[in-house]
């Protein structure tokens, strides 16, 4: 004959554990039912009666099978630099993530505690590493033969256009200006494949960035309470 199924509450056999979705109540010394996600234990079990569960109230939740006396409070509303990617329900906490153009500077178990704006590389500097959900943009100075004329958290250094006749040589923050009606090769931002900067470097007279744009090592420091780093802007 199959073993008789025990209904909660029941005393476990010596050395055995309670079944899935049950817990051992130390006071009653019985295996008792857990409450399902979205509920909490309103009345704990006794030797003769099982756990009494009740639904979580508004703005509270339980995500797991549990026997907690009170549901957990949902986190506070998302701040203005965040978006709510998961709403507060009886079964899950609110999750706030950083809105586009921001990254998570201080994460928590789920979502983000503190968002910070992505660093923007100023003209003469391009993005060396794009920002991610959890890391800031890294800027680098534009190498000879390349330029960036924008203040942007996404723009890379682009090669100067090649001119038949150069009116104004390009520098780190400005494209070359051609005298002829059209350049030999235009490096429009919309071009699908940009040639390697190295392939154009020997064709440009521009030396290393002028002293006014050459970075100090401070451009490498992450932005924080200190002033914006050289090569980046907090705007």
């Amino acid at each position: 004959l199959p073993a008789q199924v025990a209904f909660t509450p029941y005393a476990p056999e010596p050395g055995s554990t309670c079944r899935l979705r049950e817990y051992y109540d130390q006071t009653a010394q019985m295996c008792c039912s857990k409450c399902s996600p979205g509920q909490h234990a309103k009345v704990f079990c006794t030797k003769t009666s099982d756990t009494v569960c009740d639904s979580c109230e508004d703005s509270t939740y339980t995500q797991l099978w549990n026997w907690v006396p009170e549901c957990l409070s949902c986190g506070s509303r998302c701040s203005s630099d965040q978006v709510e990617t998961q709403a507060c329900t009886r079964e899950q906490n609110r999750i706030c993530t950083c809105r586009p153009g921001w990254y998570c500077a201080l994460s928590k178990q789920e979502g983000c505690r503190l968002c910070a704006p992505l660093r923007k590389c100023r003209p003469g500097f391009g993005v060396a590493r794009p920002g991610t959900e959890t890391s800031d943009v890294v800027c680098k100075p534009c190498a000879p033969g390349t330029f960036s004329n924008t203040t942007s958290s996404t723009d890379i250094c682009r090669p100067h256009q090649i001119c038949n006749v150069v009116a104004i040589p390009g520098n780190a923050s400005m494209d070359a200006v051609c005298t002829s009606t059209s350049p030999t090769r235009s490096m429009a931002p919309g071009a699908v494949h940009l040639p390697q900067p190295v392939s154009t470097r020997s064709q440009h007279t521009q030396p290393t960035p002028e002293p006014s744009t050459a970075p100090s090592t401070s451009f490498l420091l992450p932005m924080g309470p200190s002033p914006p780093a050289e090569g980046s802007t907090g705007d």
Partner: antibody, heavy 118, light 107 residues
Framework: EVQLVESGGGLVKPGGSLRLSCAAS????????MGWVRQAPEKGLEWVGQ??????????YYAESVKGRFTISRDDSKNTLYLQMNSLKTEDTAVYYC?????????WGQGTLVTVSS | DIQMTQSPSSLSASVGDRVTITCRAS??????LAWYQQKPGKVPKLLLY???SLHTGVPSRFSGSGSGTDYTLTISSLQPEDFATYFC?????????FGQGTKLEIK
């Protein structure tokens, strides 16, 4: 957790072709810059090339040693990076690593071995 | 192309030692330098970027310094797990280039 898994390596004769794939997960692939770095047996690291993201119009860059023979592409809908290698030479023999996140590399795949030999 | 030259090519040291590895670029790379550690049969691991920024999860005994063309990686007190090969890499300009590597061995 960021994961990069390369596949497609193997033995190929000089002049032959091979296509490597890199399946990415654990991060927003479409925003990431992806690249390939190789390492010949018992040698140092050599950058092969990279492809940047859509916001930069997917520019590609290559090492001089592979330019014209290798092509990097990506399929953001499949979270996959590709390296098409044509006109292979014996000196292309190496472990090829898929990398991310920029002009320096936070994450690396385990690598796939490409052997070019007659 | 920007050439990266590392020295020494190999180095013997003991646990607890302070070790310095240098990397010289053929032209100014404006601190656009990364350092990697690679153990035999393993994948390279990023240690530092921007010459002196410690990557997430890297122990503070690793530090970087330098500017212009000359850069150093310092390990303040060698641990057994630090014996490996170290590479520098410039990302100022394409093509991105690596140093030839420095093998750090147990004395």
């Amino acid at each position: 957790e960021v994961q990069l898994v390369e596949s497609g390596g193997g033995l190929v004769k000089p002049g032959g072709s091979l296509r490597l794939s890199c399946a990415a997960s654990g991060f927003t692939f479409s925003n990431a810059w992806m690249g390939w770095v190789r390492q010949a047996p018992e040698k140092g690291l050599e950058w092969v090339g990279q492809i940047k993201d859509k916001s930069n119009n997917y520019p590609t860059y290559y090492a001089e040693s592979v330019k014209g023979r290798f092509t990097i592409s990506r399929d953001d809908s499949k979270n996959t990076l590709y390296l098409q290698m044509n006109s292979l030479k014996t000196e292309d023999t190496a472990v090829y690593y898929c990398t991310t996140y920029g002009d320096f590399f936070d994450y690396w795949g385990q690598g796939t071995l490409v052997t070019v030999s007659s | 192309d920007i050439q990266m030259t590392q020295s020494p090519s190999s180095l013997s040291a003991s646990v607890g030692d302070r070790v310095t590895i240098t990397c010289r670029a053929s032209e100014d790379i404006y601190n656009a330098l990364a350092w990697y550690q690679q153990k035999p049969g393993k994948v390279p691991k990023l240690l530092l970027y921007n010459a002196n920024s410690l990557h997430t999860g890297v122990p503070s005994r690793f530090s970087g310094s330098g500017s212009g063309t000359d850069y150093t990686l310092t390990i303040s007190s060698l641990q057994p797990e630090d014996f490996a090969t170290y590479f520098c890499q410039q990302y100022y300009d394409h093509p991105l280039t690596f140093g030839q590597g420095t093998k750090l061995e147990i004395k």
